[in-house]
């Protein structure tokens, strides 16, 4: 068998709410993957899991379940979407993400997902991680690959 | 608990200068942006000066733009405000509050900036 | 620059009895995100200010339940449902929506 590879190319889209009383954010974010199959015979995607980290802290998952399959030589694009919650026990982020003085409220989140593929029985995983940029402040469409923060150090939070 | 200590004002002569300090403590300072408010001798509050958690963000009222400057170390702690060119109405009581979108949530004890021949 | 306006005194009140404090904003302090940039602070004689109401209509912490607010856009009221003799001082509302960040020039409650 010939490699699967998946490529994570960066956040879609991040919709933001507030609760105001528990000064708790929720961030929607939309993130987007590339897979593409090398092989001479379909695979099915059987699941992504995804998990959003703030400050070393998961704020968000999401499990998609028999997503798709992709032909032979094939690239598949999926969107998928991770509910996420910064909540009162980070209630500083609430008021640096609703002060409105700051025009980008640009917060570093790690990205990890998990890609579970199937062909004839056999079962592969592939996993990546990312720091993006997502701004807490406003609802924001991105530019497949703009949110993407490049420093290779953990950035400190 | 939350504190924080201002010092550096004083009797000043007009167009002298005075630096004032905020002694941040009892919360992670680097995280929160702060502001300086004024009360005037008619007890009028004023918003001054606004600067961000990591100082990229710096805003000034119409009245002290060009003739204070708002400044932080996240090492030490420490909010600043250097006052140049004074003019007898910035005589005021001056505070130091920690900012948000929940608003000045914590306030100084103040310092008073007299400018008076 | 957003205009706050205060009267400059509450219409005296009985303790034990509730008191409203107005305040009207010169633009909509209502921002896109559903937000209402309105605040309350309380400045008792001799002492800093203190936020009561943060965001319109939420207590902030370690303030007494019997302290409320709401409004529109434009229009806020403050009330206290039962005075106390804690409660004498200046109360301003301030609009946090804009910069400048612009105060009210205060309303103080008067004790009957």
């Known amino acids: 068998p010939r490699s699967i590879d998946v490529k994570y190319i960066g956040v879609k889209s991040a919709y933001v709410s507030y609760d105001v009383q528990k000064r708790t954010i929720y961030l929607n974010i939309t993130n987007t993957l590339n897979i593409t199959n090398n092989n001479y015979y379909s695979v099915e995607v059987e699941n992504i899991t995804a998990q959003v980290q703030f400050a070393k802290t998961v704020i968000g998952k999401a499990r998609l379940n028999n997503i798709t399959h992709i032909g032979p030589l094939d690239m598949k694009q999926i969107d998928y979407t991770v509910p996420t919650v910064i909540a009162e026990e980070m209630s500083y982020m609430y008021d640096f993400c609703t002060l409105i003085s700051i025009k980008v409220h640009n917060i570093v989140l790690m990205m990890q997902v998990t890609v579970t593929t199937t062909y004839f029985g056999h079962s592969e995983q592939i996993s990546q991680e990312r720091y993006q940029y997502v701004d807490c402040g406003r609802n924001t469409t991105y530019q497949l690959g703009q949110s993407e923060y490049l420093n290779v150090l953990q950035p400190q939070q | 608990e939350v504190q924080l200590v201002e010092s550096g004002g004083g009797l000043v002569k007009p167009g002298g200068s005075l630096k004032l300090s905020c002694a941040a403590s009892?919360?992670?300072?680097?995280?929160?942006?702060m502001s300086w408010v004024r009360e005037t001798p008619e007890k009028r509050l004023e918003w001054v000066a606004f600067?961000?958690?990591?100082?990229?963000?710096?805003y000034y009222a119409d009245n002290v733009k060009d003739r204070f400057t708002i400044s932080r170390d996240n090492a030490k702690n420490n909010l600043y405000l250097q006052m140049r060119h004074l003019k007898s109405e910035d005589t005021a009581m001056y505070y130091c509050a920690r900012d948000g979108g929940t608003g000045f949530t914590y306030w100084g004890q103040g310092t008073l900036v007299t400018v008076s021949v | 620059d957003i205009v706050m306006t205060q009267a400059a005194f509450s219409n005296p009140v009985t303790l034990g009895t509730s008191a409203s404090i107005s305040c009207r904003s010169s633009?909509?302090?209502?921002?896109?995100?559903?937000?209402?940039?309105l605040f309350w602070y309380l400045q008792k004689p001799g002492q800093s200010p203190q936020l009561l109401i943060y965001q319109m209509s939420n207590l902030a912490s370690g303030v007494p339940d019997r302290f409320s607010s709401s409004g529109s856009g434009t229009d806020f009221t403050l009330r206290i449902s039962r005075v106390e003799a804690e409660d004498v001082g200046v109360y301003y509302c301030v609009q946090n929506l804009e910069l400048p960040y612009t105060f009210g020039g205060g309303t103080k409650l008067e004790i009957k």
């Open positions: 633009k909509s302090l209502l921002h896109s995100n559903g937000i209402t940039y």
């Open positions: 009892g919360f992670t300072f680097s995280n929160y942006a």
């Open positions: 600067i961000s958690d990591g100082g990229g963000y710096i």
